[in-house]
């Protein structure tokens, strides 16, 4: 790659401070247009990031490889994209730097993304002060994307870009909709040509494994190193305060590199030099981190000791990133050739060897079939071995395959293969099978077909009360055998649920679909026995009846009285609901018929025992109503009722009975027999003076008939409160002589 | 050339439902918001919903909450609008619109009549 | 919600007038308000956006202004085309309510 470095004074209290160096360390570069070629170009770039016009930046070229870019007024001067042109021919390259502005609606949380093809970019911006209206993503200045202000997520907008390629490089900005470009988030995402870890035309080319946060160039597969490292892997740090391919470069100033951001050619992009981070560039790295944007940790062993510029500094007789490297060959011990893990399980393994130097923890690693290199967590150290510990990422399925160990020391390097077999815990597919009910136990069949990998460990069986949220009780069966639920609750419906184990740890698989089994009732044992009956009416039947005692609650839901019409072959069946009940009222029955009667106690759908039966005779229906019903006040506390017989008699009135109450008064009607039924009329004596009265009357023959219609009369004057009224009758042609 | 047109519209009984399309064709419209406008006769412009560009981002008029769902097919660049529960007050004339802030584009229309 | 107002809910005026129609928000809106146009038994139109930023293609007669809460829309010089309902809209965040429209007639 072209070296070629654009820095960014970040120094921001003072724009006319603000300055863009572009350094070459090419041979020759910058003299103009002898025979080295064209000079270094450094510019503003308006075509994507359109700001106000301000007064034309100055260009100062300091010797042959360097050119600076200053008088930059206010702050929106600074805002947007600039770029420096350097190199020759075909290595002509183009780096460039993105401004945001610091007092921006929104800004980026990181400037520069590099990805690999195919990879998802997440560009995440940060509300700085927000409004609330859609944000607007755009791509090298078209339009790309919304996002409502409310999908901020932890007060950032983020913008996936799944599956990037190459197409996709260039420059994003987010912006509140129709506001000023200078509140935009500026960001550049880089994306290399080929997948992680591949160079050349068809990708097909592996990358050396560039070190420190270098980046491999996907066309030619070299190390576009941090600034601050060198080599051809980037496993050289410069001195401090130096940048550069070969370190030659000195940052300005007293304080070295602090405030300033690099920018290298692509796919590397731009970040703090060695030993700074912050978006001004201006925080020291925080203890054991080191490099550019202090994304790199040391993690020194043996005695090294951690310098934010360079890394590890490591004792004598060590040497290597961590000071991990040192003399002898290893040999890893006794490997497993094939081990078995459950899906989703996070395992230790243990890979054990020796060597002198003595591995240590960081010298032994694993590799998964995918090429991901595990660390190890733990390392026990024994006279005669190292056991490193791995702690395995939560396996998925494409886990399974060959997987190695590998132990690398400064006297050399050795490997072991070991087959790794991904097991799938079982599922049931179907819900448990009921076989047989009863009141307090249900028998179930507990094997069903699963996905997923055998052989069945243990058959664990999980169940509860429908709708309840109490714990799940659990029962562990032998998977071949039937599974009889005890102490359960009588006609209660229990959601039942499987669940399968495989042997090994994580073998458990999910719980099964739920099944819904209900157990029985008990059987009502009590035996009822009437205690009497009552006719109300011609229709109705008042039937009152017994338990015997017996301790506990009292197992029913309610009695079932039967009532059977021989003569018509009908049965009558009256349901009452609760079981404290002791008396019922029969109504619509058939005047005249003879029932034979009896009761008894239900549970759910099962009848107790039937009480021994009683035999009613209904009386026949009664007269019709009397007719044309009329009330006549005689004085403050006498009304005269008058009325015709009923038509149609089916045989001799013994009665009428009178009913009286007072208009609107909230107290029981009071019935008055008038014993002569040749008589139409009668006097209700001692009512009340002044007082609305309500009458109606119906005649008996056997049983007694239909009320009359309800007639009003009001007392008259003003006379003293009476003791209540009585009746006295006669005919009504002698109440007129009279 | 950007172009909406939608489908979907005709008689329908109140209580009864009716999904509107909206084609899109001319711009990427996976980047887009959609709304649906609705115009009953003789009235103004009423906007009835959005859906922000993933599709899982929706928004709602208060008169159409609950009973309206907007969705959207990025693959088959369709806008839907599956309205549930319609009363005769949903009558109208459904259009589709793109937007970037303002609807800049709108599609024709689909007329929804709901009567009895 | 804010509640978009037109007024006046119809004019009509001769060929050449000067016009204008107002949209008050109920709450301020910033400019986050557009203008659109709708010619009888046709789609709406974007006219202005932004509450001043004329829509590509708008003849130049057409201008509108205000941020806030008060809105201008005005045709310098009406023209028998310009017969239609205008109606403004609020756009910058959910629910995007619109105006009742004002109608414009040629005397």
């Known amino acids: 790659a072209v070296d070629l470095t654009l820095l960014a004074n970040l120094r921001l209290t003072d724009p006319q401070r603000f300055f863009l160096t572009c350094v070459s360390g090419e041979a020759g570069a910058g003299r103009g247009s002898d025979a080295w070629g064209p000079p270094l170009l450094l510019e503003k770039d308006d075509r994507i990031v359109r700001t106000p016009p301000g007064p034309p930046l100055r260009l100062a070229r300091n010797g042959s490889h360097q050119v600076t870019l200053r008088g930059f007024s206010k702050p929106s001067d600074l805002v947007g994209v600039f770029s420096c042109v350097g190199g020759a021919g075909a290595r002509r390259t183009r780096v460039i730097y993105v401004h945001n502005s610091p007092g921006a609606h929104l800004l980026p949380d990181k400037v520069t993304h590099t990805v690999n093809k195919g990879d998802t970019a997440v560009l995440s911006a940060r509300v700085h002060k927000e409004k609330q209206t859609d944000v607007i993503w755009k791509s090298n200045g078209s339009y790309f994307y919304t996002l409502d202000w409310h999908e901020a997520q932890d007060g950032r907008f983020l913008l996936q870009l799944p599956n990037v390629q190459p197409p996709s490089s260039g420059i994003y900005s987010a912006t509140y909709l129709e506001a000023s470009p200078l509140g935009s988030a500026f960001f550049r995402l880089i994306v290399r040509g080929c997948g992680a870890g591949r160079w050349g035309p068809g990708c097909t080319k592996e990358c050396p494994g560039c070190l420190h946060g270098g980046v491999c160039h996907d066309h030619d597969g070299e190390c576009v190193c941090p600034p601050g490292f060198t080599g051809t892997r980037c496993e050289q740090a410069c001195r401090e305060g130096r940048f550069g391919q070969s370190c030659q470069e000195q940052c300005p100033g007293i304080s070295g590199c602090r405030g300033l951001t690099f920018c290298l050619p692509d796919p590397y992009g731009c970040s703090c030099g060695s030993g700074w981070r912050g978006s001004q560039c201006q925080e020291a790295c925080a203890p054991g981190h080191f490099g550019a944007d202090c994304r790199l940790q040391c993690q020194c062993q043996n005695g090294g000791t951690c310098d934010r510029f360079s890394g590890c500094v490591c004792p004598s007789g060590w040497h290597g990133v961590h000071c991990e490297k040192s003399d002898r060959i290893p040999q890893i011990l006794n490997m497993a050739s094939e081990l078995e893990f459950n899906l989703e399980t996070m395992p230790r393994i243990n890979c054990a060897a020796a060597g002198n130097p003595f591995p240590v923890r960081g010298s032994i690693e694993l590799r998964k079939p995918d090429g991901t290199v595990l660390l190890s967590t733990k390392a026990i150290v024994e006279p005669e071995k190292t056991t490193a510990e791995f702690e395995v990422p939560r396996l998925v399925l494409a886990d399974s395959g060959f997987w190695e160990c590998r132990v690398s020391t400064s006297g050399g390097q050795d490997s072991r293969r070991f087959k790794v077999n991904v097991k799938v815990p079982p599922v049931p597919l179907a819900a448990p099978r009921l076989l047989t009910k009863q009141s307090r136990q249900l028998v179930v069949s507990p094997l069903v077909s699963f996905s997923g990998d055998g052989p069945i460990s243990t058959v664990r069986l999980h169940y509860r009360p429908q709708d309840s949220t109490m714990d799940w009780s659990t029962i562990v069966v032998d998977p071949s055998e039937n599974v009889t639920l005890m102490n359960l609750r009588p006609k209660t419906g229990y959601s039942v649920r499987v669940q399968l184990s495989r042997p090994g740890e994580g073998g458990e698989g999910a719980w099964g679909p739920p099944t819904l089994m209900t157990t029985d009732c008990p059987e009502p044992l009590l035996q009822p026995w009437l205690e009497g009956w009552h006719v109300e009416g011609t229709d109705r039947l008042r039937v009152s009846w017994s338990l015997p005692l017996v301790p506990g609650p009292l197992v029913g839901d309610g009695f079932l009285l039967r009532l059977w019409d021989g003569t018509r072959g009908q049965e009558r069946r009256e349901n009452v609901s609760s079981p404290q009940a002791r008396t019922a009222l029969l109504t619509g029955l058939t005047p005249g018929t003879h029932y034979q009667l009896d009761v008894q106690l239900y549970h759910c759908t099962l009848l107790g025992p039937a009480s021994p039966p009683a035999h009613v005779l209904l009386p026949p229906s009664g007269p019709p109503a009397p007719r044309h019903l009329h009330a006549q006040a005689l004085s403050d506390s006498e009304i005269q009722l008058t009325w015709k017989h009923p038509e149609a008699l089916p045989g001799p009135i013994s009665k009428y009975v009178v009913e009286v109450q007072v208009a609107g008064g909230a107290g029981d009607p009071l019935w008055i027999d008038v014993d002569r039924p040749e008589e139409t009329s009668t006097i209700i004596r001692g009512l009340n003076a002044s007082t609305r009265y309500l009458f109606r009357m119906r005649a008996s023959i056997q049983g007694l008939g239909d009320w009359s219609n309800t007639v009003e009369e009001s007392t008259l004057g003003n006379g003293l409160q009476a003791e209540g009224p009585v009746q006295e009758s006669r005919a009504a042609e002698e109440g007129l002589d009279q | 050339e950007v172009q909406l047109l939608e489908s979907g519209g005709g008689l329908v009984q109140p209580g009864g439902s009716l999904r509107l399309s909206c084609a899109a064709s001319g711009f990427t419209f996976s980047s887009y918001v959609m709304h649906w406008v609705r115009q009953a006769p003789g009235k103004g412009l009423e906007w009835v919903s959005s859906?922000?560009?993933?599709?899982?981002?929706?928004l709602y008029a208060d008169s159409v909450k609950g009973r309206f769902t907007i969705s959207r097919d990025n693959s088959k660049n369709t806008l839907y609008l599956q309205m549930n529960s319609l009363r005769a007050e949903d009558t109208a004339v459904y259009y589709c619109a793109r937007a970037v802030g303002p609807f800049d584009y709108w599609g024709q229309g689909t007329l929804v009549t709901v009567s009895s | 919600d804010i509640q978009m107002t037109q007024s006046p809910s119809s004019l009509s005026a001769s060929v050449g007038d000067r016009v204008t129609m107002t949209c008050r928000a109920s709450?301020?809106?910033?400019?986050?308000l557009a203008w659109y146009q709708q010619k009888p038994g046709k789609v709406p139109k974007l006219l202005i956006y932004a509450a001043s930023t004329l829509q590509s293609g708008v003849p130049s007669r057409f201008s509108g202004s205000g941020s806030g809460t008060d809105f201008t829309l005005t045709i310098s010089s009406l023209q028998p085309e310009d017969v239609a309902t205008y109606y403004c809209q609020k756009y910058n965040s959910a629910p995007r309510p619109f105006g009742q429209g004002t109608q414009v007639e040629i005397k």
């Open positions: 709450q301020g809106i910033g400019t986050y």
């Open positions: 859906i922000y560009p993933s599709g899982g981002w929706t």
